[in-house]
């Protein structure tokens, strides 16, 4: 025997209390598949969330974040505050990356500068709060006769004191 509810299309529900007739989902609800006995409640994009796609009778609303925030989690389940490049978000708010670390995005965490010596290379360009170091060839890699490059010592960036 075929389930009579299987004939109910998306956007409707199969009414348990009325001889399993197909009824449209009420306002602010939806059913994305056929044969459902209940309609799901539409997501509401409130506060720091804003509506990217309105709820319809067959699909849920989709949210993104207001300017200054970015989405986290499946389906943008959370909004997290943006920070500037060279910063990371802590419990106390946006904090500058500590010396020896950088962040080139407006979200995420500060990451350590690359250690060029691990690859037998030298530092070509110093790192900053916003940028990683640039590694260059080691002196041994330079071809004979080529002008020698003296890598600068990893100098502290002005205003970027150790913490």
């Amino acid at each position: 025997l075929q389930d009579p509810c299987s004939n109910c299309p998306a956007g409707t529900f199969c009414d348990n209390n009325r001889n399993q007739i197909c009824s449209p989902c009420p306002p602010n609800s939806f059913s994305s598949a056929g044969g459902q006995r209940t309609c799901d409640i539409c997501r509401q994009c409130k506060g720091v969330f804003r509506t990217r796609k309105e709820c319809s009778s067959t699909s849920n609303a989709e949210c993104d974040c207001t300017p200054g925030f970015h989405c986290l989690g499946a389906g943008c389940s959370m909004c997290e505050q943006d920070c500037k490049q060279g910063q990371e978000l802590t419990k106390e708010g946006c904090k500058d990356c500590s010396f020896g670390t950088f962040n080139d995005e407006e979200h995420g965490v500060c990451r350590p500068w690359t250690d060029c010596s691990l690859d037998g290379k030298s530092v070509l360009v110093n790192g900053t709060k916003e940028r990683d170091v640039v590694c260059g060839p080691s002196p041994a890699d330079l071809s004979p006769g080529a002008s020698s490059v003296t890598p600068p010592a990893p100098a502290r960036e002005p205003g970027h004191s150790p913490q």
Partner: antibody, heavy 122, light 112 residues
Framework: QSVEESGGRLVTPGTPLTLTCTVS????????MTWVRQAPGKGLEYIGI??????TYYASWAKGRFTISKTSSTTLELKITSPTTEDTAIYFC??????????????????WGPGTLVTVSS | AAVLTQTPSPVSAAVGGTVTISCQAS????????LSWFQKKPGQPPKLLIY???SLASGVPSRFKGSGSGTQFTLTISDLESDDAATYYC????????????FGGGTEVVVK
């Protein structure tokens, strides 16, 4: 058609606890189900609901503290992720009968289980 | 989130009398009508009395009557019996994916 909760016990703060709601005479895919609790000397408090399709909705205070899930067509679970002494209460599971035929949760909670007692203490 | 404010407890009346409990919502419930009333006795689960503001739940005596719309609702118990001594709660349904339901604080009915 009936509902029964189980799994309530004494736990220490921070120890996750999962309560089970077992239904008979109907399928969880046909109705919304709700979890409600009552702390000693306090009123009824709505925790959250699950739709027939398995979507979950929580009270704002309960988000992140509780997880509702369906483990079969007749068993529903409520996980208290990190209980505190404030979570000491009788926990009830109930079906939303939707007797008016809205197609979603309407607050016509019936039947209810007898409840299961959770005590959080160190 | 919405708030449901019930008549302060306790409300007392004699056997055979009538009590009226009010439930005031800070925002209108869905469809102006999705409000339920429950009876709660110690050691027992809540019992559905009224749904959709005024519909009597199955097996509930007609002495219980629900009325109201939007933000103002009332439960009236007439021909009061000693067995009606309990705490009564209203709950409203809201158009939200969080705080979809809100319970009132409860009203204790004392039967003298």
């Amino acid at each position: 058609q009936s509902v029964e909760e189980s799994g309530g016990r004494l736990v220490t703060p921070g120890t996750p606890l999962t309560l089970t709601c077992t239904v008979s005479g109907f399928s969880l895919s046909d109705y919304y189900m709700t979890w409600v609790r009552q702390a000693p000397g306090k009123g009824l408090e709505y925790i959250g609901i699950m739709s027939g399709s398995g979507s979950t909705y929580y009270a704002s205070w309960a988000k992140g503290r509780f997880t509702i899930s369906k483990t079969s067509s007749t068993t529903l679970e409520l996980k208290i992720t990190s209980p505190t002494t404030e979570d000491t209460a009788i926990y009830f599971c109930a079906r939303d009968g939707d007797y008016a035929g809205w197609g979603y949760a309407t607050g016509a909670f019936d039947p209810w289980g007898p409840g299961t007692l959770v005590t959080v203490s160190s | 989130a919405a708030v449901l404010t019930q008549t302060p407890s306790p409300v007392s009346a004699a056997v055979g009398g009538t009590v009226t409990i009010s439930c005031q919502a800070s925002q209108s419930v869905v469809g102006n009508s999705l409000l339920s009333w429950f009876q709660k006795k110690p050691g027992q689960p809540p019992k559905l009395l009224i749904y959709s503001a005024s519909s009597l739940a199955s097996g509930v005596p007609s002495r219980f009557k629900g009325s109201g719309s939007g933000t103002q609702f009332t439960l009236t118990i007439s021909d009061l019996e000693s067995d009606d001594a309990a705490t009564y709660y209203c709950t409203g349904r809201y158009n939200s994916d969080t705080d979809t339901f809100v319970f009132g604080g409860g009203t204790e009915v004392v039967v003298k």
